[in-house]
Interface confidence: low
C-alpha cells in the first residue's frame, strides 16, 4: 500500500470520495502499531475532511475523567466523546489544523480555527502546540493554553497552586487555570449561567456561561477539498 493509498484520517477518506459525514473506521497502522480506530468524520464543514476529536452536545457523558481515560478516549462516537490523547497525538504527527465550533443556548454559532495544531506524546504530557488563530468567536481563548501540558483530576500538571482539573472539573491543557474550558461540565439551559466549571470560552459570553454545543476537529494542513 503506497502512502497515497493509505487511510490515516477523515481527509484520506474524503480524498477517496467518501463525502458523507458520519462514523467511519480507520484501519490499523502496522508501522505505528496502532489499532483500528472508530472516528466521526465531518465531510461538509468548510471543505470537509475533518476528524472530530471532541464533541459536547448532550451532556450524557461526564468529562471529569482520569488520565487513562483521556489517554485512550471515552464517550460514544455518535454522541459526546473525547477521541483520546494518544490517538490525537498520532493524528497530528502530520501538520494539522484545528477547528473549534461553538454554539450558545440562544442558537448563535461561532468558530475558531488554528493554522497549526499538535499534541506531544505522553512523555511530554500531551503538550499543546497551536498556530495562528482566525475565526469569529472574538478573543482567542486557546492562546493562554498554548504550550501547556494536559492535566486531569489524577495528574496535576498545571502552572498553578490550585488543582485546576479538580477546580474546573475536566481534563484540559490547564494553565492557571483557564481562558477556555471545553472539557468542563455540561450544564443545561437554566443552569448554564451559574457555574465556573462549565464549558466556557471566555471571549464569548465569559467564564460563567456554559455552552450548548462544542466540536473540536482536525485535518491536515495540506488538505485540498
Amino acid at each position: 500500500q503506497t502512502s497515497a493509498d493509505a487511510i490515516y484520517d477523515c481527509s484520506s477518506l474524503y480524498q477517496k470520495n467518501y463525502r458523507i459525514s458520519g462514523v467511519y473506521k480507520l484501519p490499523p497502522d502496522e508501522f505505528l502499531g496502532s489499532p483500528e480506530l472508530e472516528v466521526f468524520c465531518d465531510m461538509e464543514t468548510s471543505g470537509g475532511g475533518w476528524t472530530i476529536i471532541q464533541r459536547r452536545k448532550s451532556g450524557l457523558v461526564s468529562f471529569y475523567q482520569d488520565w487513562r481515560q483521556y489517554k485512550q478516549g471515552f464517550g460514544s462516537i455518535r454522541g459526546d466523546f473525547w477521541l483520546g490523547n494518544e490517538h490525537i497525538h498520532r493524528l497530528t504527527r502530520q501538520p494539522s489544523r484545528l477547528r473549534v465550533e461553538l454554539e450558545d443556548w440562544e442558537g448563535n454559532a461561532r468558530y475558531a480555527e488554528y493554522s497549526y495544531f499538535a499534541l506531544g506524546n505522553e512523555l511530554n504530557s500531551y503538550r499543546l502546540f497551536l498556530g495562528n488563530y482566525s475565526g469569529n468567536v472574538g478573543k482567542d481563548a486557546l492562546l493562554y493554553h498554548n504550550n501547556t501540558v494536559f492535566s486531569t483530576k489524577d495528574k496535576d500538571n498545571d502552572n498553578c497552586l490550585d488543582k485546576c482539573a479538580q477546580l474546573r472539573k475536566g481534563g484540559y491543557w490547564y494553565n492557571c487555570c483557564t481562558d477556555s474550558n471545553l472539557n468542563g461540565v455540561y450544564y443545561r439551559l437554566g443552569e448554564h449561567r451559574k457555574h465556573m466549571d462549565g464549558i466556557s470560552w471566555y471571549g464569548w459570553h465569559g467564564a460563567n456561561y456554559s455552552l450548548k454545543r462544542v466540536e473540536m476537529k482536525i485535518r491536515p494542513e495540506a488538505f485540498k477539498p
Epitope: 458523507i20 458520519g22 462514523v23 448532550s58 450524557l60 464517550g75 460514544s76 455518535r78 454522541g79
Partner: antibody, heavy 120, light 107 residues
Framework: QITLKESGPTLVKPTQTLTLTCTFS??????????VGWIRQPPGKALEWLAL???????RYSPSLKSRLTITKDTSKNLVVLTMTNMDPVDTATYYC????????????WGRGTPVTVSS | DIQMTQSPSSLSASVGDRVTITCRAS??????LAWYQQKPGKAPKLLIY???SLQSGVPSRFSGSGSGTDFTLTISSLQPEDFATYYC?????????FGGGTKLEIK
C-alpha cells in the same frame, strides 16, 4: 406516517440462507443520522440485536453472528435487506426491523415482526 | 460486550400501584439507556431514551432515572394497559445489548 414492514420466508431448512427484507416509508435512509436495525426474539425469550446500517453505509453487526450476517440497503427503494447464512433451529425467532434515529443507538419505531422457523 | 441485568424477572402488581423495575449494566454507560414495553404478539415500543427522556406520546406516569451502571423505570400508577414485558437496552456502544426482560402481571 412512518411504517416499517418485514418480509421473508416463514420456514427455512437447516444450513439454508435466510433473506429478510425491511420495507419502510415516511423517512429516508439518505437523511443524516438515520439507521435501520434488525433485532430478533426467540419464542418466550429476550430481544437480541443483530445488525445496523446507517445513511452513510456504516454497518454494525453482533460479534457472535458477524460471520453469518450481511446487511445492505437500497436507499432509492426504501428497503434494507438482512441475509443470514447457515441457519440452525436455534435461529427460530421473530425478526424485527426498526428505525434508529438521532444521536444514540436506540430504536424509536419498529415493524410488526416476521416469524421464522428453522426446521427440516 | 456490555451485559444488562434486569430485576425482577417477573412482578405481580395491582392497578394503581407504583412499580419500579431496575436494570444494571456490567460497566458504566453514562445515560445511554433506553426502555421498551412489549405486549404479547406485538413489537416493542420505545418508552424512555437517554435514561430519563420520555418518548413522544408516552404517558407521563412512566419515568426513567439513573446514570452509570444502575437504572430504574418507574410507573407511578399502574393502568390496565401497562401489564406487559419491559426491556432495557444500552445504547452506549455496539454490540447493542438488551436486558432479559421484566414481565409485569396482574396480581
Amino acid at each position: 406516517q412512518i411504517t416499517l414492514k418485514e418480509s421473508g420466508p416463514t420456514l427455512v431448512k437447516p444450513t439454508q440462507t435466510l433473506t429478510l427484507t425491511c420495507t419502510f416509508s415516511g423517512f429516508s435512509l439518505s437523511t443524516s443520522g438515520v439507521g435501520v436495525g434488525w433485532i430478533r426474539q426467540p419464542p418466550g425469550k429476550a430481544l437480541e440485536w443483530l445488525a445496523l446500517i446507517y445513511w452513510n453505509d456504516d454497518k454494525r453487526y453482533s460479534p457472535s453472528l458477524k460471520s453469518r450476517l450481511t446487511i445492505t440497503k437500497d436507499t432509492s427503494k426504501n428497503l434494507v435487506v438482512l441475509t443470514m447464512t447457515n441457519m440452525d433451529p436455534v435461529d427460530t425467532a421473530t425478526y424485527y426491523c426498526a428505525r434508529d434515529y438521532g444521536d444514540y443507538w436506540f430504536f424509536d419505531l419498529w415493524g410488526r415482526g416476521t416469524p421464522v422457523t428453522v426446521s427440516s | 460486550d456490555i451485559q444488562m441485568t434486569q430485576s425482577p424477572s417477573s412482578l405481580s402488581a395491582s392497578v394503581g400501584d407504583r412499580v419500579t423495575i431496575t436494570c444494571r449494566a456490567s460497566q458504566g454507560i453514562s445515560s445511554y439507556l433506553a426502555w421498551y414495553q412489549q405486549k404479547p404478539g406485538k413489537a416493542p415500543k420505545l418508552l424512555i431514551y437517554a435514561a430519563s427522556s420520555l418518548q413522544s406520546g408516552v404517558p407521563s406516569r412512566f419515568s426513567g432515572s439513573g446514570s452509570g451502571t444502575d437504572f430504574t423505570l418507574t410507573i407511578s400508577s399502574l393502568q390496565p394497559e401497562d401489564f406487559a414485558t419491559y426491556y432495557c437496552q444500552q445504547s452506549f456502544s455496539t454490540p447493542l445489548t438488551f436486558g432479559g426482560g421484566t414481565k409485569l402481571e396482574i396480581k
